[in-house]
């Protein structure tokens, strides 16, 4: 049985050109992380693999940075990076546990931050 | 196509070390990961542990971890594992395995798709 | 370390016939199972993964069933070039191989 929750930072906003952390946790549940995706859309931006570490897909390599923790930076941002981000917890045994970001890159320099949480 | 050719049969003296090689063609080497397999006479498959060929980070089985030491190197697409202070239980058939999914492709990885041909490493006195 | 059970140990069928191959985990994997055929001398060959999903080139004959802790490959019409040893691997959570099942010619 699925016992856990993913909470995530929601929705976010971001500077043109800045960067942003985006960042999920996954909690109530013992289960082990085997493998954490990003994806955007339908795009893989990164993986962690428990065993074999941080793996940034080609195609993102000059803009994405791994963490903290199995958190994402997405540096130089574009009003193209504007939509929906997944991160995607491979679990043992429980399963896969998704959560969902939504980050709009603003023109304007008074770009707001939604609610973040602190992880442990 | 795509393949793995391993190196040739080794024999090999309790005490000693091998390395064995595993030569990759046919797609872009670092965008998977490289398992090695054992499989001693008669016996069943035993994984001995794995490389990304990307960045390089290994995750060896626990019963061999401190004598076993996988590398890669993608100037030539090969993979390497080295096995030392070898004893005679070490006499196997040792494969090379590549994963079946990309890193890119976002799957759960750990079912191997393309197999060297084996190297046969045997440890006698 | 998750153990995979196999059974039976060796199966003895006619061509033809059905074979029915067992595989257990002592934990649940989910989908995250292969199955492999070995012929001797030979390295394994890829016929089954994510549980159910046959790998390129792999006859329609062969299918794979289950999800968690129980699972089944299934050969509906044995042909020669089937007799073997089949393995399944679990990798939910690092690598496992199961024992092994021999397909012999009864």
């Known amino acids: 049985m699925m016992t856990g929750t993913i909470e995530t930072t929601g929705n976010i906003s971001a500077e043109k050109g800045g960067s942003i952390i985006l960042q999920c946790h996954l909690s109530s549940t013992t289960a082990q992380v085997t493998q954490v995706n990003w994806e955007q859309q339908d795009q893989l931006l990164a993986i962690c693999n428990a065993d074999l570490g941080w793996h940034i897909s080609p195609s993102f390599k000059d803009r994405v940075a791994p963490g903290p923790g199995l958190g994402l930076t997405l540096q130089s941002l574009t009003v193209n990076d504007t939509g929906e981000y997944f991160c995607i917890y491979h679990t043992y045994p429980d399963g896969t546990y998704t959560g969902r970001i939504f980050l709009e890159v603003l023109e304007s320099s008074v770009a707001e931050h939604g609610a973040r949480f602190q992880i442990p | 196509q795509v393949q793995l050719v391993q190196s040739g049969a080794e024999v090999k003296k309790p005490g000693a070390s091998v390395k064995v090689s595993c030569k990759a063609s046919?797609?872009?080497?670092?965008?998977?990961?490289i398992s090695w397999v054992r499989q001693a006479p008669g016996q069943g498959l035993e994984w001995m542990g794995w490389?990304?060929?990307?960045?390089?980070?290994?995750n060896y089985a626990q019963k061999l971890q401190g004598r076993v030491t996988m590398t890669t190197d993608t100037s030539t697409s090969t993979a390497y594992m080295e096995l030392r202070s070898l004893r005679s239980d070490d006499t196997a058939v040792y494969y090379c395995?590549?994963?079946?999914?990309?890193?890119?492709?976002?799957?759960?990885?750990?079912?191997?798709?393309?197999w060297g041909q084996g190297t046969m490493v045997t440890v006698s006195s | 370390e998750i153990v995979m059970t196999q059974s039976p140990a060796t199966l003895s069928v006619s061509p033809g016939e059905r074979a029915t191959l067992s595989c257990r985990a002592s934990?649940?994997?989910?989908?995250?199972l292969a199955w492999y055929q070995q012929k001797p001398g030979q390295a394994p060959r890829l016929l089954i993964y994510?549980?159910?999903t046959r790998a390129t080139g792999i006859p329609a004959r062969f299918s794979g069933s289950g999800s968690g802790t129980e699972f089944t490959l299934t050969i509906s019409s044995l042909q020669s070039e089937d007799f073997a040893v089949y393995y399944c691997?679990?990798?939910?959570?690092?690598?496992?191989f199961g024992g092994g099942t021999k397909v012999e010619i009864k």
């Open positions: 395995a590549r994963d079946l999914s990309s890193f890119w492709s976002g799957d759960v990885l750990g079912a191997f798709d393309i």
């Open positions: 046919g797609y872009t080497f670092t965008s998977y990961a």
């Open positions: 490389i990304s060929a990307y960045n390089g980070n290994t």
């Open positions: 934990q649940s994997v989910s989908s995250n």
């Open positions: 994510g549980a159910s």
């Open positions: 691997q679990q990798h939910a959570n690092h690598i496992t």
